[in-house]
């Protein structure tokens, strides 16, 4: 696996294992995971001390670490795309096994500001210094490594395995050897707490094979939150030693009989448990049997106890632990109910806001109210929503249907509306004629007029071309359809007399761009259409975004 020497420390309800091996963070997490754990958390100073202890144990065994400053992966990571967050203790990092953003941290230095790369945390150990409880390993952040390239100075990793509970180590009343095999496949002969479901092999005797006896025990849950080996009396007892060997294996007092036999006993205020070795307080609350914020309440005469939960919580089936009451089961809200630890909160659907009669009531948001309308032009409020409408000459546009876009009547589905030239304007259009022709009174047809070499007649006058009130223009486009950007003279469209076979557009207009600019301008010249043109006219590139502009690659101009 690439992970070699290991050390183990068990305390509370967790075991920590330290491994040497140059692995990436993902490989290290996979190694921990295969045995039912995760890369270790360091959520408090106490936990940091446990982790330091297991690393010290590893370093005593491991002489060949190559770097003076060695790093060991822990389970603190920041996913790709999640930015460093300086306002949080964990700086936007989170524990691989889940869990809340804990207040404890011990960063080595200011963190690198990044978002794109996945980042992982290792414990930084200066191997030239002794490991002292007052000098806990610092957290170092960096790339997570990859197979064959774990990252600079990575020497190993620390795993954490959590359990329902622990058994006390087996007590030997005479010479012998205990070997514990944990659920995470570690063997050890010296654990200060032994995790639930571990096996213990006891070989009694002083190494003389003829006198050796073997015993096998399993750490089981005897009662809720009570873990026990199921053995009774000290193991490997020998009349030769009596109480003189390891206090006879007794937890507190050892009493010898005249024949070399002995018994375990307890001090005042304590009682001997079923294993005939261990002593427990007579006050049942002294062992803190209640969990999860539950308070232990002594029963009459101090004989038994009950657990009591704070408001918003109730006892679970074990009667020892508090679980959140789901107040949302009673439907206390008008719309959405969100259960929270110890309480709940009401929320409203999109388009509604808190208000109205009663607790948790919701009322319709008037999206069309003055100052908050999302619509470019017309807005109609509906229950829980709204819809937009546009004035004549405009159609709804935009991803969310809130914008209004000018209808280019010059390229409408029915073909050009003018006999000759057509000038689209915001919300309307005008017809015009080629040189030598004049616009008929109907505003559409052209009649022969006096010969002129001037520009085509009919571009809209300044006063004619005004936008409709409330209209919008394409994003980042100028609002003037016939005037170029500042400092650009108004151009005259080039024209040629169209023929029936003509495939070319009658006019071409340049794309004008302010680059780079605060409000890039797009300038459109009028489209020119002729009743006899065989193919539809093309809109110049960079035109009003209401028109699908024909591009050289044959795609339309819209994304």
């Amino acid at each position: 696996t690439g992970a070699d020497t290991e050390a183990v420390v068990c305390v509370g309800t967790a075991c920590y294992t330290a491994h040497s091996g140059k692995l990436s963070a993902a490989e290290a997490q996979n190694h921990c995971n295969q045995n039912g754990g995760n890369l270790a958390t360091v959520k408090s100073k106490e936990e940091a001390q446990h982790v330091q202890r297991v690393l010290a144990q590893l370093l005593r065994r491991e002489a060949a670490l190559t770097a003076r400053m060695s790093k060991f992966w822990i389970g603190l990571q920041r996913e790709k795309g999640k930015c460093l967050d300086p306002s949080l203790p964990l700086k936007g990092f989170s524990w691989v096994g889940g869990g809340e953003d804990t207040p404890y941290s011990n960063w080595h230095k200011e963190l690198r500001n990044s978002c794109i790369s996945k980042r992982c945390v290792s414990l930084l150990l200066d191997l030239s210094q002794p490991l002292l409880p007052s000098r806990l390993p610092k957290w170092s952040e960096g790339p997570c490594g990859s197979p064959g390239s774990p990252g600079s100075n990575i020497e190993g990793f620390v795993c954490k395995f959590s359990f329902k509970g622990m058994c006390r180590p087996l007590a030997l009343g005479g010479p012998g050897q205990v070997t514990y095999t944990t659920p995470f496949q570690t063997t050890s002969s010296s654990l200060e707490a032994v995790p639930f479901a571990s096996a213990a092999n006891v070989a009694c005797g002083e190494g003389d094979k003829d006198e050796t006896q073997s015993h096998y025990f399993l750490c089981k849950e005897k009662a809720p939150d009570v873990f026990d080996w199921g053995s009774s009396g000290p193991l490997c007892v020998s009349p030769k030693y009596g109480c003189n060997f390891n206090n006879g294996g007794c937890h507190q007092d050892c009493f010898e009989g005249g024949d070399g036999s002995f018994l375990c006993g307890c001090r005042p205020g304590f009682r001997l448990l079923d294993d005939l070795v261990t002593c427990a307080s007579r006050n049942p609350c002294s062992s803190s049997p209640c969990r999860g914020g539950a308070t232990c309440v002594l029963g009459p005469h101090g004989k038994n106890y009950t657990c009591r939960c704070p408001q918003g919580y109730q006892l679970d089936s074990s009667q020892l632990d508090c679980v959140d009451v789901d107040e949302c089961q009673d439907s206390p809200c008008a719309q959405e109910c969100v259960n929270t630890p110890g309480g709940f909160r009401c929320e409203c659907w999109v388009g509604y806001e808190p208000g109205g009669p009663g607790e948790g009531a919701c009322q319709d948001v008037d999206e069309c109210a003055l100052g908050r309308s999302p619509c470019a032009q017309g807005c109609t409020n509906t229950d829980g929503s709204f819809h937009c409408s546009c004035e004549e000459g405009y159609v709804l546009a935009g991803e969310d249907g809130t914008q209004c876009q000018d209808v280019d009547e010059c390229v409408g589905p029915g073909g050009p509306l003018c006999d000759s030239l057509c000038f689209n304007t915001q919300g309307s259009f005008h017809c015009g004629c080629l040189p030598g022709w004049v616009l008929a009174p109907n505003g559409v047809s052209c009649t022969m007029g006096p010969v002129s070499l001037g520009p085509p007649s009919g571009p809209p006058d300044e006063e004619d071309k005004g936008e409709k009130e409330g209209s919008t223009v394409p994003r980042a486009a100028t609002a003037s359809p016939t005037r170029g950007p500042e400092g650009t003279p108004k151009a005259t469209p080039t024209t040629s007399r169209p023929s029936l076979s003509s495939d070319a557009p009658i006019t071409s207009a340049p794309l004008k761009m302010l680059a780079p600019s605060g409000s890039p301008g797009v300038w459109r010249e009028p489209s020119i259409h002729h009743a006899t043109a065989a193919s539809g006219p093309q809109e110049p590139a960079g035109g009003d975004s209401s028109v699908a502009t024909q591009n050289n690659d044959g795609t339309d101009g819209q994304k």
């Epitope: 790709k80 795309g81 930015c83 460093l84 967050d85 300086p86 306002s87 690198r112 500001n113 990044s114 978002c115 794109i116 790369s117 996945k118 790339p143």
Partner: antibody, heavy 120, light 108 residues
Framework: QVQLQQSGAEVKKPGSSVKVSCKAS????????MHWVRQTPVYGLEWMGG????????AYNQNFKGRVTITADKSTSTAYMELSSLRSEDTAVYYC?????????????WGQGTTVTVSS | EIVMTQSPATLSVSPGERATLSCRAS???????LHWYQQKSGASPRLWIY???NLAFGIPARFSGSGSGTEYTLTISSLQSEDFAAYYC?????????FGGGTKVEIK
């Protein structure tokens, strides 16, 4: 002080590719991510993607459908943005930008911009 | 992706007057990840306000930013001649980063 110097304007044919460079100075190149934003008249400012020069990891805007490739050369402190299968609507000003010592993708430093014109 | 909608597209204001620019997100955005940029004609955008309400270095105190969730605002208490420019909002809550379409503040 931080400076981002971009390559000069380009005129390209539809279907071709363009590669714009951005040379960084005034800071350690691998300390900050480098991002690319373009500006067109119709679509305004669009984030194209970014790179972490320390690791070479990248993030892209999927709207560009794999046409964008961002790379970084640590030896020359230069980032590159290549856009392929050019079309007329790729005519834009292209900026390299980074957020320096600020957090949460607040783009503090910008190059001067490179105008790319796509025309047949 | 989150769509940022700025309104109005153009704001005509006289010098000395107050200007309020709006930026609306299609989904909720963390206030830490909402920024504003100023851009003048022919220049690159410049960071103006970061994390909703923090003025970038050298930005005058007449500018302020506020908002949360989907609604954000940039306010100029008393417009000066140098404030006439385009302003863009930008968000990040997962890729892609997106910008608003901009509000052009012009002299009335």
């Amino acid at each position: 002080q931080v400076q981002l110097q971009q390559s000069g304007a380009e005129v390209k044919k539809p279907g071709s590719s363009v590669k714009v460079s951005c040379k960084a100075s005034g800071y350690t190149f691998t300390d900050y991510e480098m991002h690319w934003v373009r500006q067109t008249p119709v679509y305004g400012l669009e984030w194209m993607g970014g790179i972490d020069p320390e690791t070479g990891d990248t993030a892209y805007n999927q709207n560009f459908k794999g046409r964008v490739t961002i790379t970084a050369d640590k030896s020359t402190s230069t980032a590159y943005m290549e856009l392929s299968s050019l079309r007329s609507e790729d005519t834009a000003v292209y900026y390299c930008t980074n957020y320096g010592n600020l957090y949460y993708y607040a783009m503090d430093y910008w190059g001067q911009g490179t105008t790319v014109t796509v025309s047949s | 992706e989150i769509v940022m909608t700025q309104s109005p597209a153009t704001l005509s204001v006289s010098p000395g007057e107050r200007a309020t620019l709006s930026c609306r997100a299609s989904s909720s955005v963390s206030s830490s990840y909402l920024h504003w940029y100023q851009q003048k004609s022919g220049a690159s955008p410049r960071l103006w306000i970061y994390s909703t309400s923090n003025l970038a270095f050298g930005i005058p105190a007449r500018f302020s930013g506020s908002g949360s969730g989907t609604e954000y605002t940039l306010t100029i208490s008393s417009l000066q001649s140098e404030d006439f420019a385009a302003y863009y909002c930008q968000q990040y809550s997962g890729y892609p980063l997106t910008f608003g379409g901009g509000t052009k503040v012009e002299i009335k």
